[in-house]
């Protein structure tokens, strides 16, 4: 029962996380114009991975897509790639995990196969979450770098009385959505991996009894059958889970690099 609950919860958490990753990837507010030093503009800019938008005080919003591939910064391309990889892996993971759910019966699928699929989807969710967190963190780091660079030369004088205020950008809502969604997907993946342990049949020692007509003493044959889980013995399984736990710890500590923001 606990295994089913863990697996189900892992699936739901991952589903929410992947929906969040998709939402974050599609959102236009990855970076928003910093208004701290210049709150008096009647025009406001925010940018996403796919287009840039301008919102006027009038309420009019105009968005323009980045209709170029070669002209875009390599970092932006990398973030796009990470987010897409995260979505693709997450989607495949969801598909696999649906069939792996203990509460869903598909033909005569053995628990060992379900355990296998649960672990596969769990690993996919973990990698998907890591991709999203990495993508968002790379973009955040890019923003921080550009923010301080533009602060250093805040006013790019045009000579004489005229001056143009350089636009600075700060964290947009999509970054926070991405971080949370990536974290949820990661947690969901870990839960799936934990559920996998419970799904895998324990190593069972069947006592084979042989009867002989001659009336000899009964022979016991221990270990006549080993439960096949498809991924080796439980000690090997343990390594996989430990690795997963380590990965989770690494992810949780990763955003701390950006604590200075």
């Amino acid at each position: 029962m606990a295994v089913t609950a863990c697996q189900g919860l892992g699936f739901v958490v991952s589903l929410i996380g992947i929906a969040g990753i998709i939402a974050a990837t599609c959102m236009d507010q990855w970076s928003t114009q910093d208004l701290y030093n210049n709150p008096v503009t009647a025009v406001f800019n925010y940018q996403g991975l796919w287009r840039s938008c301008v919102r006027e005080s009038s309420g009019f919003t105009e968005c323009r897509g980045y209709f170029t591939l070669l002209g875009l910064p390599a970092m932006l391309q990398a973030v796009r790639a990470l987010m897409i990889v995260g979505i693709v892996l997450g989607a495949i993971g969801l598909l696999v995990s649906i069939f792996a759910l203990k509460c869903i019966r598909i033909g005569s699928m053995e628990d060992s196969a379900k355990a296998n699929m649960t672990l596969t989807s769990g690993i996919m969710f973990i990698v998907s979450g890591l991709c999203a967190i990495a993508g968002v963190s790379v973009f955040a780091n890019m923003l921080v770098t550009n923010f301080w660079m533009s602060t250093a030369n805040m006013y790019t004088g045009m000579g004489g009385m005229v001056q143009t205020v350089q636009t600075r950008y700060t964290f947009g809502a999509a970054l926070f959505v991405g971080w949370v969604a990536g974290g949820l997907t990661l947690i969901g993946g870990v839960m799936m991996c934990i559920a996998c342990r419970g799904l895998a049949p324990e190593e069972t020692n069947y006592k084979a009894v042989s009867y002989h007509a001659s009336g000899h003493s009964v022979a016991y044959k221990p270990g006549g059958f080993k439960a096949s889980t498809g991924f080796g013995s439980n000690t090997k399984n343990k390594k996989i889970y430990d690795g997963g736990a380590r990965t989770e710890d690494e992810v949780q500590s990763y955003p701390s690099k950006h604590d200075y923001v």
Partner: antibody
Framework: QIQLVQSGSELKKPGASVKVSCKAS????????INWVRQAPGQGLEWMGW????????TYAEGFTGRFVLSWDTSVSTAYLQISSLKAEDTAVYFC???????????WGQGTLVTVSS | DIVMTQSPDSLAVSLGERATINCKSS????????????LAWYQQKPGQPPKLLIY???TRESGVPDRFSGSGSGTDFTLTISSLQAEDVAVYYC?????????FGGGTKVEIK
């Protein structure tokens, strides 16, 4: 069509208060901001501030804080400009204008003359 | 505040002739986000409210005759009346719509010579 209709002329004594109204029709009132512009006799145009009836946001120009209050009533699609402690230098024509795409004032009220005289 | 300086203060032009009004802002009105200049031109006749002619520096408002045109970018802008008509006698104002407070130029009075 889009119309902004302002209240009639007002003659007030110094120290009194006045409330100028601007009734909007022909569009969804909460979708666009209403700006107020002052024009003293024989002078140019001076932006006073604006309200966004959709968000409740108000912005005032530096010389128009304190005595000047912008408000609105969505139920009657009307914006208001209230001036308290009137002074002789408040004598002017007050216009309301809709803020439209391009941050442009595409529709204007006919103007309300406020005369402050003892 | 952004200072909008209009020149000349008044202008007398013969009917059918070209009238040119200049407007200079103390800061660039070109927004890098969409490459638009946030400048508008208004016409005000005596006893009437101002009427919008041009926005985004060069986009003509619907219903405005095509003899009115706007040009310029950054800090220097121009309103041109290609062939002055009697009904064009008015005061013309430029207005920046980029920074708060939104500010108007001092106005240019156009008369017939």
């Amino acid at each position: 069509q889009i119309q902004l209709v302002q209240s009639g002329s007002e003659l007030k004594k110094p120290g009194a208060s006045v409330k100028v109204s601007c009734k909007a029709s022909g569009y969804t009132f909460t979708n666009y901001g209403i700006n107020w512009v002052r024009q003293a006799p024989g002078q140019g145009l001076e932006w006073m501030g604006w309200i966004n009836p959709g968000t409740g946001e108000t912005t005032y120009a530096e010389g128009f804080t304190g005595r000047f209050v912008l408000s609105w009533d969505t139920s009657v699609s009307t914006a208001y400009l209230q001036i308290s402690s009137l002074k002789a230098e408040d004598t002017a024509v007050y216009f309301c204008a809709r803020l439209y795409y391009g941050n442009r004032f595409d529709s204007w009220g006919q103007g309300t003359l406020v005369t402050v005289s003892s | 505040d952004i200072v909008m300086t209009q020149s000349p203060d008044s202008l007398a032009v013969s009917l059918g002739e070209r009238a040119t009004i200049n407007c200079k802002s103390s800061q660039s009105l070109l927004y890098s986000g969409n490459q638009r200049n946030y400048l508008a031109w208004y016409q005000q006749k005596p006893g009437q409210p101002p009427k919008l002619l041009i926005y985004w520096a060069s986009t003509r408002e619907s219903g405005v005759p095509d003899r009115f045109s706007g040009s310029g970018s950054g800090t220097d802008f121009t309103l041109t009346i290609s062939s002055l008509q009697a009904e064009d006698v008015a005061v013309y104002y430029c207005q920046q719509a980029y920074y708060y407070p939104l500010t108007f130029g001092g106005g240019t009075k156009v008369e017939i010579k």
